[in-house]
C-alpha cells in the first residue's frame, strides 16, 4: 500500500461565518471539511469549549464509488431564539487520530433593541409612604440609557438625565401608573406599565374607650388615605389563649377571629357578645376604594369581670332545735368571673335580718339564738365575685328536722349579735 | 469479540529490516483509526504512530518517522509495520491498537497480545 | 513532547485499603473543556486494558472501585478497596498532543 501523507494541512475547507443580530434571531452557523475514508464526528466550540448539547446536524457526501476515498462532511449548528449567552467565537473541531484540527473562527454578535432584564411590578403601597421601582436593560449595543415615566409623563428631560436603574417615589396620594423607557443606538424598547395602587395608611393608635364584662368599646386613629376617603374598617377580636401564640405583629391568629365591621366616622366601635373576664387580641384595618390598608398589631384587652347571672342552685335548710343547716350548690347561670364565695342571710318573722359571709363553702350550720322558738324563718344565698354580688335566691323556708334523716356534722356558726352589715330585704 | 493478532515479530540483526503484521477481527476495519505502540522489556509503553481509515493520512512520532511506515490493507483486514535501519534500542514488544472515540476524542481502547522483536547481531 | 511522570514507582497496599497513583503532565492537557488524560492497567503478560479516560470516565466493564480525578497538570487514579486482582503495572497516558505520551508505570502490589 502506498505510504500516507502526515496529518498536517487541515481538513476543513468551509469555516463558519459572522452572525449579528438582534434577540430572538435565528441563524446557523456552517463549516465544512473534506477527509479520506470514515468521516469523523465534527464538535462545535464556543470560546474554546465544547458545545455538549449542540443543535448539530452533519451531512457527509462521498465523492467516489469506495468509501475510502473523499468525503465532504458539512457540520451545520443552528442557532435558535439568540440571547446574549450565545454570542462568541465559534469553530468547528475534530479529532482525526490523535491529532486535533479547528476552523477558523466565525462570530456570533448580538445587537438590536435593548433588552429588558428588570422591569417595574405592580404593586400596593400605603397613601405618602416612599418607595422604589426598579427597571434595568442591556444591549448591544451600549449605552443604554433609562427614561422613567409616571402616568405615560416623562419625568426627565431626556433619557439617561433622571434616575437610572431605580426611581425613588416619596409618596403618593392617589393610584399611578409607571413605566421606563430604554434607550440605545437602535431605537427605543418601552417597559411594561407596572400599576401602583394607594392603599391607606394602617390605623394607629388602637386602644379601649371602655369596658363592660361582655363589651369593649374601642376607637382608633385612622391613617391617610391619599384622594379615596374611607369606606369603613374592619375589626377583628381573637381569645388570647392566655396570651399563646400571638405576639406583636405576628401576622395570623391561632384560631378564627370574630370579625365587625365599623362605618367610619366615627372611628370607634363596640363589640358586644364577648365573654367576661377575658383576655382578647384586636386589631384594625381600614379600606378605601382601592383596598384594604395592612392590619395594626394585635392589641392585648381584657374583658372585666361581671356578677354571677344567677343565685345558687338547690338550696336546702333543715332546722333541728337551735341549729338550723343550710346546703346549696353553684349556680348555673355564668359566674362572669372568680367565684370568690357566698352570702347567706336568714329572718324570721318578727326579728331582724341576719347577713352572713359564707366564702367558698357551700354548707353552713347556723347556730340560732333563744330557745328556737322563732317562727316562719327563711334562708337567702347569693354567688359573689369581685364585681359584686349576683342575684339572691328566692327566701327558703326552714323545715323542722324529723328523725331519721341524715344531718352531717358541720362546724357551728354562732348567729352574730347584730347583722355584720346591712342588707335590703327582698 | 474484538481481536487483534500481531505477528512477524522474531530475531533480526542491527540495520535490518523486519514487516510486522496485525489482522483484525470482530469488528468493521474499515471504519477504524488503528495505531502501533511498542514496551521495551521491563519499561513503559511508546507510541510509535497510527493511519486513518482510508490509509491516506498517517501521525508518527517524530522520531520513528524515517524508520517505520505504517500501512493497512482494509480488504484483509491487516494492519502494517514495515521497519527498517533498526537498532538495539528497538527491541520490544509491539502492539497492534485500535482506536475509538471515547470523549469526543480517541482512545485505545482494544490492544493485541504484541509481538517479540529482538534485536541483536 | 509532553513528558508524564508517575509517582511513586512502586507501591504496596494491603487488602481493602486505598492505592492512590498520582500523574504529572509538564504542562496543561486540557483542551476544549476536556481533561485529555488516560489510566492503563497492565497484567504481567497481557497488554494494557483501558481504565480511564477524560481524567474520570470509567472504561467499558470496569470496576466502580477504580475513579480518576483531576485536571491541568495533576491527576490521581484511585483504587478502592484494593482486591487481589488489582495488583499490576498502572500507566497515565495523555492524549493532547501528538505523539500521545505515557507515564513510565506504577507497580502496585499487595502488602
Known amino acids: 500500500a502506498p505510504r500516507g501523507t502526515q496529518a498536517e494541512e487541515s481538513p476543513f475547507v468551509g469555516n463558519p461565518g459572522n452572525i449579528t443580530g438582534a434577540r430572538g434571531l435565528t441563524g446557523t452557523l456552517r463549516c465544512q471539511l473534506q477527509v479520506q475514508g470514515e468521516p469523523p464526528e465534527v464538535h462545535w466550540l464556543r470560546d474554546g469549549q465544547i458545545l455538549e448539547l449542540a443543535d448539530s446536524t452533519q451531512t457527509q457526501v462521498p465523492l467516489g464509488e469506495d468509501e475510502q476515498d473523499d468525503w465532504i462532511v458539512v457540520s451545520q449548528l443552528r442557532i435558535t431564539s439568540l440571547q446574549l449567552s450565545d454570542t462568541g467565537q465559534y469553530q468547528c473541531l475534530v479529532f482525526l487520530g490523535h491529532q486535533t484540527f479547528v476552523s477558523q473562527p466565525g462570530y456570533v454578535g448580538l445587537e438590536g433593541l435593548p433588552y429588558f432584564l428588570e422591569e417595574p411590578e405592580d404593586r400596593t403601597v400605603a397613601a405618602n409612604t416612599p418607595f422604589n421601582l426598579s427597571c434595568q436593560a442591556q444591549g448591544p449595543p451600549e449605552p443604554v440609557d433609562l427614561l422613567w415615566l409616571q402616568d405615560a409623563v416623562p419625568l426627565a428631560t431626556a433619557p439617561g438625565h433622571g434616575p437610572q436603574r431605580s426611581l425613588h417615589v416619596p409618596g403618593l396620594n392617589k393610584t399611578s401608573s409607571f413605566s421606563c423607557e430604554a434607550h440605545n443606538a437602535k431605537g427605543v424598547t418601552t417597559s411594561r406599565t407596572a400599576t401602583i395602587t394607594v392603599l391607606p395608611q394602617q390605623p394607629r393608635n388602637l386602644h379601649l374607650v371602655s369596658r363592660q364584662p361582655t363589651e369593649l368599646e374601642v376607637a382608633w386613629t385612622p391613617g391617610l388615605s391619599g384622594i379615596y376617603p374611607l369606606t369603613h374598617c374592619t375589626l377583628q377580636a381573637v381569645l388570647s389563649d392566655d396570651g399563646m401564640g400571638i405576639q406583636a405583629g405576628e401576622p395570623d391568629p391561632p384560631e378564627e377571629p370574630l370579625t365587625s365591621q365599623a362605618s367610619v366616622p366615627p372611628h370607634q366601635l363596640r363589640l358586644g357578645s364577648l365573654h367576661p373576664h377575658t383576655p382578647y387580641h384586636i386589631r384594625v384595618a381600614c379600606t378605601s376604594s382601592q383596598g384594604p390598608s395592612s392590619w395594626t398589631h394585635w392589641l392585648p384587652v381584657e374583658t372585666p369581670e361581671g356578677v354571677p347571672l344567677g343565685p345558687p342552685e338547690n338550696i336546702s335548710a333543715t332546722r333541728n332545735g337551735s341549729q338550723a343547716f343550710v346546703h346549696w350548690q353553684e349556680p348555673r347561670a355564668p359566674l362572669q368571673g372568680t367565684l370568690l364565695g357566698y352570702r347567706l342571710a336568714y329572718q324570721g318573722q318578727d326579728t331582724p335580718e341576719v347577713l352572713m359571709d359564707i366564702g367558698l363553702r357551700q354548707e353552713v350550720t347556723l347556730e340560732l339564738q333563744g330557745d328556737g322558738s322563732v317562727s316562719n324563718l327563711t334562708v337567702c344565698v347569693a354567688a359573689y365575685t369581685a364585681a359584686g354580688d349576683g342575684p339572691w335566691s328566692l327566701p327558703v323556708p326552714l323545715e323542722a328536722w324529723r328523725p331519721g334523716q341524715a344531718q352531717p356534722v358541720h362546724q357551728l356558726v354562732k348567729e352574730p349579735s347584730t347583722p355584720a352589715f346591712s342588707w335590703p330585704w327582698w | 469479540e474484538v481481536k487483534l493478532l500481531e505477528s512477524g515479530g522474531g530475531l533480526v540483526q542491527p540495520e535490518g529490516s523486519l514487516k510486522l503484521s496485525c489482522v483484525a477481527s470482530?469488528?468493521?476495519?474499515?471504519?477504524?483509526?488503528m495505531s502501533w505502540v511498542r514496551q521495551a522489556p521491563g519499561k513503559g509503553l511508546e507510541w510509535i504512530g497510527e493511519?486513518?481509515?482510508?490509509?491516506?493520512?498517517?501521525n508518527q512520532t517524530p522520531s520513528l518517522k524515517d524508520k517505520f511506515i505504517i500501512s493497512r490493507d482494509n480488504a484483509k483486514n491487516t494492519l502494517y509495520l514495515q521497519m527498517s535501519k533498526v537498532r538495539s534500542e528497538d527491541t520490544a514488544l509491539y502492539y497492534c491498537?485500535?482506536?475509538?472515540?471515547?470523549?469526543?476524542?480517541?482512545?485505545?481502547?482494544?490492544w493485541g497480545q504484541g509481538t517479540s522483536v529482538t534485536v541483536s547481531s | 513532547e509532553l513528558q508524564m511522570t508517575q509517582s511513586p514507582a512502586s507501591l504496596a497496599v494491603s487488602l481493602g485499603q486505598r492505592a492512590t497513583i498520582s500523574c504529572r503532565a509538564s504542562?496543561?492537557?486540557?483542551?476544549?473543556?476536556?481533561?485529555?488524560m488516560n489510566w492503563f492497567q497492565q497484567k504481567p503478560g497481557q497488554p494494557p486494558k483501558l481504565l480511564i479516560y477524560?481524567?474520570?470516565n470509567q472504561g467499558s466493564g470496569v470496576p466502580a472501585r477504580f475513579s480518576g480525578s483531576g485536571s491541568g497538570t495533576d491527576f490521581s487514579l484511585n483504587i478502592h478497596p484494593m482486591e487481589e486482582d488489582d495488583a499490576a503495572m498502572y500507566f497515565c497516558q495523555q492524549s493532547k498532543e501528538v505523539p500521545p505520551t505515557f507515564g513510565g508505570g506504577t507497580k502496585l502490589e499487595i502488602k
Open positions: 504542562e496543561s492537557v486540557d483542551n476544549y473543556g476536556i481533561s485529555f
Open positions: 491498537v485500535r482506536l475509538s472515540v471515547v470523549f469526543y476524542y480517541y482512545g485505545m481502547d482494544y
Open positions: 493511519i486513518n481509515p482510508a490509509g491516506s493520512t498517517i
Open positions: 477524560a481524567a474520570s
Open positions: 470482530g469488528f468493521d476495519f474499515r471504519r477504524y483509526w
